[in-house]
């Protein structure tokens, strides 16, 4: 197993690369990783006190 990304290309992340479905590019580790779906719930009815918080669907494992 290689030592770490710093020894390869420093800590500055390159531009994201295309990933297969169910994956996305993680700037932290600079690789494609398992990814869930981000979603924004439908707005609450008029008069609701605050906007619905943004949530997400868990990654499919």
């Amino acid at each position: 197993m290689r030592r770490g990304p710093r020894s390869l290309r420093g800590r500055d992340a390159p531009a994201p690369t295309p990933c297969v479905p169910a994956e996305c590019f993680d700037l932290l580790v600079r690789h494609c990783v398992a990814c869930g779906l981000l979603r924004t719930p439908r707005p609450k009815p008029a008069g609701a006190s605050s906007p619905a918080p943004r949530t997400a669907l868990q990654p499919q494992e």
Epitope: R2, R11, D26, L27, L28, V29, V33, A34, G36, R54
Partner: antibody, heavy 125, light 107 residues
């Protein structure tokens, strides 16, 4: 159910070694990054190392580089932290954690969503 | 490495209060900031990720905002179970770094 369970902590003399294990269940560690984070008594959180098993990619905090080695066995769904040349300042509760990612325009939006219960490492003579 | 500076380091508040904790990054981290809650003897819990997204199961009284270098965690109405220590963390560039923590105590 996703779960992380650490083991391997204990009392060790300065200069000694320990290997911590982080057994995962409910998901495959292969395509997620697994992190070790420690917390010295009464102090804050300090990131130690991460591994992305599918890529064989790792990184370390400067404070442990050259002394600690992170690894993973995907067949056992377990990550490890080999700690050598231990010092008094390595005394801490060590947690393993999974970084979860959500797809935001093709890029990960995420955080460490599941953590183990922690295992105490005490370095003392 | 990117430094994450939280303020205040501690605060006293009462149940029902609105509480705001801030975190400043030493360089631009876009929206790659998460917030965690930790209680004594327990592992941290993820509250907010990507600066403003509420993690699954977290009460909606928690919210996050910010981008670039300045970030905020807000608890709209403090509940008894919210007395804990809160940490920010950036994950834009390795190494991922944590703030020093903010302890929320009962007034």
């Amino acid at each position: 159910e996703v779960q992380l369970v650490e083991s391997g902590g204990g009392l060790v003399q300065p200069g000694g070694s320990l290997r911590l294990s982080c057994a995962a269940s409910g998901f495959s560690i292969a395509r997620s990054s697994i992190h070790w984070v420690r917390q010295a008594p009464g102090k804050g959180l300090e990131w130690v190392a991460w591994i992305l098993p599918s890529a064989g990619s790792t990184d370390y905090a400067d404070s442990v580089k050259g002394r600690f080695t992170i690894s993973a066995d995907t067949s056992k769904n377990t990550a490890y932290l080999q700690m050598n040349s231990l010092r008094a300042e390595d005394t801490a509760v060590y947690y393993c954690a999974r970084r979860v990612c959500y797809n935001r325009l093709g890029v990960c939006a995420g955080g460490m969503d599941y953590w183990g219960q922690g295992t105490l490492v005490t370095v003392s003579s | 490495d990117i430094q994450m500076t939280q303020s205040p380091s501690s605060l006293s508040a009462s149940v029902g209060d609105r509480v705001t904790i801030t975190c400043r990054a030493s360089q631009d981290v876009s929206t790659a900031v998460a917030w965690y809650q930790q209680k004594p003897g327990k592992a941290p819990k993820l509250l907010i990720y990507s600066a403003s997204f509420l993690y699954s199961g977290v009460p909606s009284r928690f919210s996050g905002s910010g981008s670039g270098t300045d970030f905020t965690l807000t608890i709209s109405s403090l509940q008894p179970e919210d007395f804990a220590t809160y940490y920010c963390q950036q994950s834009r560039i390795t190494p991922p770094t944590f703030g020093q923590g903010t302890k929320v105590e009962i007034k």
